[in-house]
């Protein structure tokens, strides 16, 4: 019978042999066999699996001139940059007619200095605020302990002692440096340097301390900052989007916010240039050498009402008999405010000076005391807020009414008993 | 909690042989080396040397070359000194102390036992 | 082999008092200095390593400073159960050497 064909006869005249090494170790698996007639193809199993992409070279050498005379078969199997999952049993398999042979195993095994899966990684983290660290690392050969340092002084009196996997620092007052050394009975490997920024606190209690119609004082409780003073806060202020603003603790405002920094202490800052009757929405960030804090939530605050900034516009008074008719428009000037009416005084050169709320209407019709006799009578009106009344028109002498002109039906307002309130305007 | 126990005292003659064990629990015994301290009535402390409990390879300081022993039982947990030829000299106190990881040494000794006390008269 | 200096073999001092004890090494030692401490019933137990580090179950009051070849202890707050004797001890090479010991007691 050809060689190879007996079940208790196989073909392989050398095995593979065993390879131990550390990680990224290239190496070589070598089986030999010799058969009569056509040379097998030699396949290659780990832990009894063929192995389907295995970097292979096989090699035969006739040992004859005639085709069935013995061949020399050599198949080598390349280990490149060995790794856990290249380890265990490797055997060489034929098929030679109808059997299968299988050599004896070789064992390809792993050992050396510990390997990082995972390890430190540099981050920020507020002044006194725990924070966590990871480190993992693994053999063969195990087991593999862990001995962290901060600042290069390890934590522990030897690896294996103090936190392993995950180490909890309680808080930090410098930025510092940690790492993780890895041991086994190989020796050690140490892991990146992770630094550990340490910045500011996020700052506290961000109020209002005072309000203008166009500035808004604010306050601010720091938070801890570490060995590092503050060197400044930011602040910013933006305008709340019509009703629809941002929520306070949505993390960016729709539009560019207005910036300005406060030298600390005192930690407060006047907010001047804003819109009076307007909502708005600010932040700070306090900074030290390290860098900035995080922004404190958005805080939603109101400019008050002011006074409206002019008088009214285009006065006219035009009078006939004893009635006189006044109308203005709104002022130009900006309201700062809900407009909620305006004022009228007049005044003859021997009355007193009478005052009247008009309301929200821009004429009026007075009926005049006496038979209009009164001289030289000249009318004022002033806007008002909430905030109170605007500045006052300069005084516009009373016209006579000529024939022509249009004379509208208004309502007659009667002169008060009384004037309501006088103010020396002129 | 780790303890380290070690052996009673010895009282022995001139010449002979003692050996003091140290049991240790509370540790993977063969990670950490074994360091051996002696110390003189009223004295300091002298580092005698250390084994390796991870491959048994013993190390001693200049003077403790040549009588002393350290030796291991492992699957006991246990290091053991001996030493021969006893003088008066030797009359001391003994101690293990845990330290150094595998082959490295240079971690402190965080962990010590009781001490042994020999006495060599005759 | 590295020296260790202990030049204060005993001091005495009182309830409450602030003690420094220090240590000299011959050569740097690259901060491997570690302090035990030895009570009169003979037991040994590691306080400081690496300069400063505290073991588990020290007590606050106890530091450790210095680098090169310069360190101290300190006891920021002596009670009765500090009286003891301090050994100093280099880490950074072998053979390992400890200082003589400063032996501390209460007035």
């Known amino acids: 019978a050809p060689r190879g064909t007996q079940a208790e006869e196989s073909p392989f005249v050398g095995n593979p042999g065993n390879i131990t090494g550390a990680r990224g170790l290239t190496g070589t698996l070598r089986c030999q066999l010799q058969v009569q007639g056509e040379p097998p193809e030699v396949h290659w199993l780990r832990d009894g699996q063929i192995l389907e992409l295995a970097d292979s070279t096989q090699t035969q050498v006739p040992l004859g001139e005639d085709e069935q005379d013995d061949w020399i078969v050599v198949s080598q199997l390349r280990i490149t940059s060995l790794q856990l999952s290249d380890t265990g049993q490797y055997q060489c398999l034929v098929f030679l007619g109808h059997q299968t042979f299988v050599s004896q195993p070789g064992y390809v095994g792993l050992e050396g200095l510990p390997y990082f899966l995972e390890e430190p990684e540099d981050r920020t983290v507020a002044a006194n605020t725990p924070f966590n660290l990871s480190c993992q690392a693994q053999g063969p050969p195990e087991p593999v302990d862990l001995l962290w340092l901060q600042d290069a002084v390890p934590l522990a009196t030897a690896p294996g002692h103090g936190p392993q996997r995950s180490l909890h620092v309680p808080g930090l007052n410098k930025t510092s440096s940690f790492s993780c050394e890895a041991h086994n009975a190989k020796g050690v490997t140490t892991s990146r340097t992770a630094t550990i920024t340490v910045l500011p606190q996020q700052p506290r209690n961000l109020h209002l301390v005072s309000r203008q119609p166009t500035e808004l004082e604010v306050a601010w409780t720091p938070g801890l900052s570490g060995i590092y003073p503050l060197t400044h806060c930011t602040l910013q202020a933006v305008l709340s989007d019509d009703g629809m603003g941002i929520q306070a603790g949505e993390p960016d405002p729709p539009e560019e916010p207005l910036t300005s920094q406060a030298s600390v202490p005192p930690h407060q800052l006047r907010l001047g240039s804003l819109h009076p009757h307007t909502p708005y929405h600010i932040r700070v960030a306090c900074t030290s050498s390290q860098g900035p804090s995080s922004w404190t939530h958005w805080l939603p605050v109101e400019t008050p009402e002011g006074v409206p900034l002019g008088p009214p516009e285009n006065i006219s008074a035009t009078r006939n008999g004893s009635q006189a008719f006044v109308h203005w428009q709104e002022p130009r000037a900006p309201l700062q405010g809900t407009l909620l009416g305006y004022r009228l005084a007049y005044q003859g050169q021997d009355t007193p000076e009478v005052l009247m709320d008009i309301g929200l209407r821009q004429e009026v019709t007075l009926e005049l005391q006496g038979d209009g006799s009164v001289s030289n009578l000249t009318v004022c009106v002033a806007a008002y807020t909430a905030a109170g009344d605007g500045p006052w028109s300069l005084p516009v002498p009373l016209e006579a009414w000529r024939p022509g002109q249009a004379q509208p039906v208004h309502q007659l307002v009667k002169e008060p008993s009384t004037p309501a309130f006088s103010w020396p305007w002129w | 909690q780790i303890q380290l126990v070690q052996s009673g005292p010895e009282l022995k003659k001139p010449g002979e042989t003692v050996k003091i064990s140290c049991k240790a629990s509370g540790y993977t015994f063969t990670k950490y080396g074994m360091n051996w301290v002696k110390q003189a009535p009223g004295k300091g402390l002298k580092w005698m040397g250390w084994i390796n409990t991870y491959t048994g390879e013993p190390t001693y300081a200049d003077d403790f070359k040549g009588r002393f022993a350290f030796s291991l039982e492992t699957s006991a947990s246990t290091a053991y000194l001996q030493i021969n030829n006893l003088t008066t000299e030797d009359m001391v106190t003994y101690f293990c102390?845990?330290?150094?990881?595998?082959?490295?040494?240079?971690?402190?000794?965080?962990?010590w036992g009781q001490g042994t006390s020999v006495t060599v008269s005759s | 082999d590295i020296q260790m200096t202990q030049t204060t073999s005993s001091l005495s001092a009182s309830l409450g008092d602030r003690v420094t004890i220090s240590c000299r090494a011959s050569?740097?030692?690259?901060?491997?200095l570690n302090w035990y401490q030895q009570k009169p019933d003979g037991t040994v137990k590691l306080l400081i390593y690496y300069i400063s580090r505290l073991h588990s179950g020290v007590p606050s009051r106890f530091s450790g400073s210095g680098s090169g070849t310069d360190y101290s202890l300190t006891i920021s707050n002596l009670e009765l159960e500090d009286v003891a004797t301090y050994f100093c001890?280099?880490?950074?090479?072998?053979?390992?050497?400890f200082g003589s010991g400063t032996k501390l007691e209460i007035k």
């Open positions: 001890q280099q880490g950074n090479t072998l053979p390992f050497t």
């Open positions: 050569q740097d030692i690259n901060n491997y």
């Open positions: 102390a845990k330290g150094g990881y595998y082959s490295n040494p240079i971690y402190p000794m965080d962990y």
